[in-house]
């Protein structure tokens, strides 16, 4: 089945529930779980096979304000020599993640949700050749 | 929160930072991007350090619908397809932000939450300790 | 339930090769890896070889020349063969399930052994 | 590989008493994911090897819980806290953080 739209739901709407404005959403920006860590392996970027760095991109109209992204350092893939290994590749693995972009109108603000495709890290893969007719 | 530039032309009342409460429009930019990792790449079967991606739903959640990783084996795959444990698959994880309903069963009232995926894996070198 | 057995000759003759099945039920070879393991009479477990859900195989070192792992996932069953046999591979050959998909790692479930007799 | 080490080789019990084993590796057995691949194995006479405890201190399911699993890095330790005729048998201690190896066994019996 599909997906129902954010504002849809299976459940009955209880009494509780704030009145929202029609075609829009309240949402709480004080985030849940805010204070988790990532508690990745120590500095797998360096040592992965399909090593990666981080930039980090910052953008004061969007909450969160900074997002890290992720770049491979070589096309192919390090080999146990140390040396890049050209018949593997290494490639990006992305996640999507939500912000809120804050909009200005003339002297209005606006909120929008949007989708941001963020590049967490890279792994290596062995090719997909074509073969030329 | 987070320092806003302000239209210098605007009265001054404005609040710089993010507001803890806003009303956003129920549209989402980018919503129609494909979240089914499955379909978007087959970099899970193809990687040296493969994975299996397992369902997670919540009707409570927006998206309802996560693909977490989970790295296939301890050890990667070598270049004649053995697994090899000189080398470690290890998960990539990260912090995504996603909608929570709030109060719970709320069609158009949420919070953020941040929740912790794992996304693929990688091949990394393992570090090695030797009993002295 | 899950299950597996083990179907193998007994005896085996020096410098033979020796071929054992095992076949599997209550479970997939497409979602779990399935290891081979053998016990010396009175001795410990020695860990053979390992073919992954995925269809790959790890193998112990010592032992890899002569080993060869293989499967059958439409009739269910996991094939080992050894090469080479001395009075020293005399043992029970176990095969055992790994727990691949709940990510333990470890082997959970074992069949009940074939005893092997290298002999002349 | 690895080399697991049991000891002892050999441990004479009385029903109802605690009984310790230990287990130590060559190697550190925790994995750049984080975590210790370290399981317990019992193989009561003339039966196959029957999981206990794996990851170091989680009970297989239908284990009794008077069995625990602890250590780190590279020590670890089983733990029956009351004996029971049916503990009987060959206790293995096994790895998978690196290619498989056990430990050589130890043997609880009763005193």
């Known amino acids: 089945r599909k997906i129902p739209k954010v504002g849809h739901t299976f459940f009955q709407k209880p009494e509780s529930c704030p009145p929202v404005p029609g075609g829009s959403m309240k949402l709480d920006i004080g985030i849940i779980n805010e204070n988790q860590r990532v508690s990745m392996s120590r500095n797998i970027e360096s040592r992965s096979t399909s090593p990666w760095n981080y930039t980090v991109t910052w953008d004061p109209n969007r909450y969160p304000s900074e997002v890290v992204q992720a770049q491979c350092r070589n096309l192919g893939c390090i080999n146990a020599q140390g040396k890049e290994d050209i018949s593997m590749n290494s490639v990006p693995i992305q996640q999507e993640t939500l912000v809120v972009r804050r909009k200005h109108q003339g002297c209005s603000v606006s909120f929008q949700l949007e989708k941001v495709l963020v590049t967490v890290g890279c792994t290596c893969v062995t090719p997909v050749i074509h073969h030329v007719q | 929160g987070i320092t806003i530039p302000r239209n210098p032309g605007c009265p001054n009342s404005e609040d710089k930072n993010f507001p803890r409460t806003v009303m956003v429009n129920l549209n989402i930019h980018n919503r129609n991007t494909n979240t089914n990792p499955k379909r978007s790449s087959d970099y899970y079967n193809r990687s040296t350090s493969p994975w299996n991606l397992h369902r997670n739903e919540d009707p409570e959640r927006y998206p309802s619908v996560i693909w977490e990783a989970k790295c296939r084996h301890l050890g990667c795959i070598n270049a004649d397809g053995n697994v090899d444990y000189h080398m470690n698959s290890v998960p990539i994880q990260q912090e995504i932000l996603v909608l929570r309903r709030e109060p719970p069963h709320c069609p158009n009232s949420f919070r953020l939450e941040k929740i912790l995926v794992s996304v693929g894996c990688t091949c990394v070198t393992p570090i090695v300790h030797h009993v002295a | 339930q899950v299950q597996l057995k083990e179907s193998g000759p007994g005896l085996v003759a020096p410098s033979q090769s020796l071929s054992i099945t095992c076949t599997i039920s209550g479970f997939s070879l497409t979602s779990y890896g399935v290891h081979w393991v053998r016990q010396p009479p009175g001795k410990g477990l020695e860990w053979l070889v390992v073919?992954?859900?995925?269809?790959?195989?790890t193998y112990n070192s010592a032992l890899k020349s002569r080993l060869s792992i293989t499967r059958d996932n439409s009739k269910s069953q996991v094939f080992l063969k050894m090469n080479s046999l001395q009075t020293d591979d005399t043992a029970i050959y176990y095969c055992?399930?790994?727990?691949?998909?709940?990510?333990?790692?470890?082997?959970?479930?074992w069949g009940q052994g074939t005893p092997v007799t290298v002999s002349s | 590989d690895v080399v697991m080490t049991q000891t002892p080789l050999s441990l004479p019990v009385s029903l109802g008493d605690q009984a310790s084993i230990s287990c130590r590796s060559s190697?550190?057995?925790?994995?750049?994911?984080?975590?210790?691949?370290l399981h317990w194995y019992l193989q009561k006479p003339g039966q196959s090897p029957k999981l206990l405890i794996y990851k170091v201190s989680n009970r297989f399911s239908g284990v009794p819980d008077r069995f625990s699993g602890s250590g780190s890095g590279t020590d670890f330790t089983l733990k029956i806290s009351r004996v029971e005729a049916e503990d009987l048998g060959v206790y293995f201690c096994s790895q998978s953080t690196h290619v498989y190896t056990f430990g050589g066994g130890t043997k609880l019996e009763i005193k």
């Open positions: 073919i992954w859900s995925d269809g790959t195989t």
């Open positions: 190697q550190s057995l925790v994995h750049s994911n984080g975590n210790t691949y």
């Open positions: 055992a399930r790994d727990s691949t998909w709940d990510y333990y790692y470890t082997m959970d479930y």
